[in-house]
């Protein structure tokens, strides 16, 4: 993980643990500027309530695998997801969900009802977002679940269904 | 740009490039605490799909010009916009949009349908938000576009239509 | 307040003010890594337009008291609140609000109309969020106000009504 704000160093991984003692360059480089982040766009073809993401997204200090972002550095993470939905209303209302999961357990969710009027309509667009500020250990997983994945609009809006994470405060 | 967390220094601009070598004060001051941010409220009078913003907003390490926020320091930026809409529904639905543009190109958008029932109504309020985590070079521009700017509620909610940006991780 | 990214130090309070001069460890420890954050979930039982929050939430460098988060360190704060609403629609529309208050004054608000069709419906779910990037002094208060607190869904979604704050840039 490149420490963005520490010039003149080529090491890729932060110095974990260790006692820098009075070695100030060591202290400076090893701690103040640790950064981890991800910005992933949803896969074009969804076939599961657990969303999958394009692996070519921006990712730094985390690992993506099978729909999960895997934490590499313990700390307080800000997690935010935003999804664009497209529903063709029929004569009943539809509940759209967006759930953030940590270690496969729902931690926070959004629920919005559309097509409430029961009027048949060409296209109803809706947008859901959800955030979480959560302390995560190494190897914790972050994932996203929706009930009706068929309504996630990956056609009109391929860039607009996003899971983003950044480390606010490192703890090692 | 004042580096907020570095006391006892009066220089306004961060030390860009350069080799601090073993000069620790130089290293400390030039990198760990670089901050850039903006918090702008929409102009009272809109006449364009590209929104304009009040220049008296909070702005630090970026420049505002002609509807654009212009980046001064390269790095990973968190961008978030939130708009409050007011629509008087008639007998057709209305699609409200909020688009974030980087260098005049749409990078992320929100689309929400209101007045779906076709029932005439006094006032329908709706709120859209959109975020982006994006790596930006010096002189990159950030702007916002809406399709129906006449629905952006600048009267009742002059403070509630906001474009905000902050630098998460500096790269120089 | 523990400075998360400064190892090998046990002091709990940041060095405020003071002149570190050429004492680099002092400079390093006193400033670059100051962190304050909170992540609070709404109380189960609401009886006021000013929301109250569970005191057992995550809180660091701020104090919670009587519905207010009280700032301990001056700086630029990112504040975000998200609420899940549940409305049983009858024959009239309902305006849901979410207002962020600084020192008891509305600084930013979200307003969304539901039940616009006038059609009686079992349950309509709606989700509102609001953010603010604001400079706060010591003892400033952050609170949240809603008009129709009876619609905040504390039953189905006890974990999903959240006020979160983090210090982006410290100024002392």
């Amino acid at each position: 993980q490149k420490k963005d704000s520490t010039p003149n160093t080529t090491e890729k991984a932060p110095l974990k643990g260790g006692n820098c003692s009075e070695d100030l360059f060591c202290t400076l480089k090893s701690t103040p500027s640790k950064k981890s982040w991800a910005y992933l766009q949803v896969s074009k073809h969804l076939n599961n309530t657990k969303l999958s993401w394009n692996e070519d997204g921006t990712i730094h200090g985390l690992i993506y695998q099978d729909g999960n972002l895997i934490v590499q550095f313990p700390g307080l993470y800000f997690i935010v997801c935003q999804l664009q939905f497209l529903v063709q209303c029929s004569n009943h209302s539809v509940d759209l969900t967006l759930q953030l999961l940590i270690n496969s357990k729902i931690k926070k969710q959004t629920l919005v009802t559309v097509c409430e009027s029961g009027v048949q309509s060409k296209n109803i667009y809706q947008n859901l977002s959800q955030f979480l500020l959560h302390y995560l250990q190494v190897n914790s997983t972050i994932s996203v679940r929706v009930d009706n994945f068929q309504y996630v609009d990956t056609n009109t809006f391929p860039l607009d269904n996003v899971l983003s994470v950044f480390l606010y405060s490192s703890s090692d | 740009q004042k580096k907020d967390s570095t006391p006892n220094t009066t220089e306004k601009a961060p030390l860009k490039g350069g080799n601090c070598s073993e000069d620790l004060f130089c290293t400390l001051k030039s990198t760990p605490s670089k901050k850039s941010w903006a918090y702008l409220q929409v102009s009272k009078h809109l006449n364009n799909t590209k929104l304009s913003w009040n220049e008296d907003g909070t702005i630090h390490g970026l420049i505002y010009q002609d509807g654009n926020l212009i980046v001064q320091f390269p790095g990973l930026y968190f961008i978030v916009c939130q708009l409050q809409f007011l629509v008087q529904c008639s007998n057709h639905s209305v699609d409200l949009t909020l688009q974030l543009l980087i260098n005049s190109k749409i990078k992320k958008q929100t689309l929400v349908t209101v007045c779906e029932s076709g029932v005439q109504s006094k006032n329908i309020y709706q709120n859209l938000s959109q975020f982006l985590l994006h790596y930006l070079q010096v002189n990159s521009t950030i702007s916002v576009r809406v399709d129906n700017f006449q629905y952006v509620d600048t009267n009742t909610f002059p403070l509630d239509n906001v474009l905000s940006v902050f630098l998460y991780s500096s790269s120089d | 307040q523990k400075k998360d990214s400064t190892p090998n130090t046990t002091e709990k309070a940041p060095l405020k003010g003071g002149n570190c001069s050429e004492d680099l460890f002092c400079t390093l420890k006193s400033t670059p890594s100051k962190k304050s954050w909170a992540y609070l979930q709404v109380s189960k039982h609401l009886n006021n337009t000013k929301l109250s929050w569970n005191e057992d939430g995550t809180i660091h460098g701020l104090i919670y008291q009587d519905g207010n988060l009280i700032v301990q360190f001056p700086g630029l704060y990112f504040i975000v609140c998200q609420l899940q609403f549940l409305v049983q629609c009858s024959n009239h529309s309902v305006d849901l609000t979410l207002q962020l208050l600084i020192n008891s004054k509305i600084k930013k608000q979200t307003l969304v109309t539901v039940c616009e069709s006038g059609v009686q419906s079992k349950n309509i779910y709606q989700n509102l969020s609001q953010f603010l990037l604001h400079y706060l002094q010591v003892n400033s208060t952050i609170s949240v106000r809603v008009d129709n607190f009876q619609y905040v869904d504390t039953n189905t979604f006890p974990l999903d009504n959240v006020l979160s704050v983090f210090l982006y840039s410290s100024s002392d």
């Epitope: - | 006094k122 | 609401l46 049983q88 009858s90 529309s93 309902v94 305006d95 609000t97 129709n148 619609y151």
Partner: antibody, heavy 120, light 107 residues
Amino acid sequence: EVKLQQSGDELVRPGASVKMSCKASGYTFTDYAMHWVKQSPGQGLEWIGSIIPLIDTTSYNQKFKGKATLTADKSSNTAYMELSRLTSEDSAVYYCARLGSRYLEGFDYWGQGVMVTVSS
Amino acid sequence: DIQMTQSPSSMSASLGDTVTINCLASQDIGNYLSWYQQKPGKSPKLMIYGATNLEDGVPSRFSGSGSGSDYSLTINSLGYDDEGIYHCHQYYEYPLTFGSGTKLEIK
């Protein structure tokens, strides 16, 4: 048509209690908060408290805690206020009022009022 | 608690006059202010809500203005039917509070 129909005027002895009602019609009772307001003779208006039938939650003005008890019966669309340990200070007209559901709406409908006279 | 200071406490004006009643809150109340008209022996009637919004059925001669903590009610072309007591009311914060009332008489 929205209507709030209050019970009749009351003449009561000091130390006694009184329970008045406010029957709502013309709208969905559980959708709105019902508030109670006191108006002493020749005086201004004072907020006593409110009840939200949907979630059975009450809020009180500190001044009236222990004096007023608010309840609601969803089956009959009726809100109630009981005043206890009455003194001459409690002689007043008491109104129920509905707070609107749209943004910034105030008390859009009021009952006709109940005059309570406390006298021995 | 938020205090609402209403002025004047009473006033007399002639038919066709314009009158203004003021209400000062002890803190910012974010436009959560209503004006009510009350006639003798009757319930208060909502005239203005949200500081500036005219309630349905209320003549356009009535208007509300203000923001923050300072609000006013203006009645143009005063008519006989405008006689009564006018109350301001904040519903921004619990406990809800009212002004002391302004008695308006027509000469």
